[in-house]
């Protein structure tokens, strides 16, 4: 299963901090960066770095501690950029994360200094079963960029 999250300030759940997606092992979390056609908004485009953080980092929307790992950067607002996280128990990659069933993981975005963005937050709850099927569950929509 692929869970698509449109990561931008127009996504009210990310903005409120009550967005929770439930994923199973072998699912994918697809993060879609903000994308603008034409000149973009008058206040400027949203650009930011996305971090996996611990609970205190999620609560305070801070990504500066030793448990705040930079995952991706959304810095090309006029291109189509998407990142994927595979929810797996063991990772073959040194920069990958190992996800444990029953645990919750926290993602936040920290706007770059020149960006118009705000703090956005997402909780990822990892469930127990391994899944094989391919389907998509979006959070937000592309029109919310």
């Amino acid at each position: 299963v692929r869970h698509v999250v449109y990561w931008n300030s127009s996504n009210p759940r990310l903005l409120r901090g009550d967005a929770v997606v439930e994923l199973g092992l072998n699912d994918y979390l697809d993060i879609v960066c903000p994308h603008y056609e034409g000149p973009g908004p008058p206040e400027g485009p949203e650009t930011f770095a996305l971090y996996m953080v611990d609970w205190p980092g999620y609560e305070s929307c801070q990504a500066e501690g030793p448990r705040a790992f930079k995952r991706w950067v959304c810095s090309l607002p006029f291109g189509h950029v998407q990142f994927s996280e595979k929810i797996q128990r063991f990772t073959p990659f040194s920069l990958g994360f190992e996800f444990l069933p029953g645990e919750t993981y926290y993602y936040i975005s920290v706007p770059t200094p020149e960006s118009s963005g705000q703090c956005l937050r997402l909780q990822v709850s990892v469930c127990c079963k391994e899944r094989k099927s391919e389907s998509a569950h979006p959070v937000g929509s592309p029109g919310e960029s």
Partner: antibody, heavy 120, light 112 residues
Framework: QVQLVQSGAEVKKPGASVKVSCKAS????????IHWVRQAPGQGLEWMGW????????KYNERFKGRVTMTTDTSTSTAYMELRSLRSDDTAVYYC?????????????WGQGTSVTVSS | DIVMTQTPLSLSVTPGQPASISCRSS???????????LYWYLQKPGQSPQLLIY???NRFSGVPDRFSGSGSGTDFTLKISRVEAEDVGVYYC?????????FGGGTKVEIK
Amino acid sequence: QVQLVQSGAEVKKPGASVKVSCKASGYTFTGYYIHWVRQAPGQGLEWMGWIYPGNFNTKYNERFKGRVTMTTDTSTSTAYMELRSLRSDDTAVYYCAREDGSPYYAMDYWGQGTSVTVSS
Amino acid sequence: DIVMTQTPLSLSVTPGQPASISCRSSQSLVHSNGNTFLYWYLQKPGQSPQLLIYRVSNRFSGVPDRFSGSGSGTDFTLKISRVEAEDVGVYYCFQATHVPWTFGGGTKVEIK
């Protein structure tokens, strides 16, 4: 003022388990990580792992995985570290320490230490 | 695991003289978030360790300004500008960038 008070010295036989307690006061217990660090006689410091009392998340040093369990009782603001299958080289002073948050992310307050002796 | 190598192992210093302790890590201590989680602790005889320096160069509250930390990447230094009798003990560097978090082997400072 912040204080971490640990349980008293223990003498254990090889193969046994020990559970050391660390009672916190003077701050909001659920808002700070608690670490466990040990020091063998005449040796340096070794980080064992941490627990976050706010959600009970733990991270253990792989060297102790399977033998160590860190828990907390939020009703009494007490952290516990249990070490199983004790060996003679587990003889050490065991410290609990609080990790302060931003901007430090450092172990700023330490317990007085608990001496654990493993001997047959 | 990250190996933290401290030099020298011991140091005998005349009061009022400077002292310098080096700490070298087996890998860069720059975290993916850009911060460097390198700390210095002092363990006085018969006491628990106490925090001196956090994140490379910041003095913890109550730490005298004769203590300073510097460095980047894999090489770090703790300097005491004028050693006093109360500074005796074992100094440890400590990294929290990579799990497992690891301490250096310690540097024993004594007064001549």
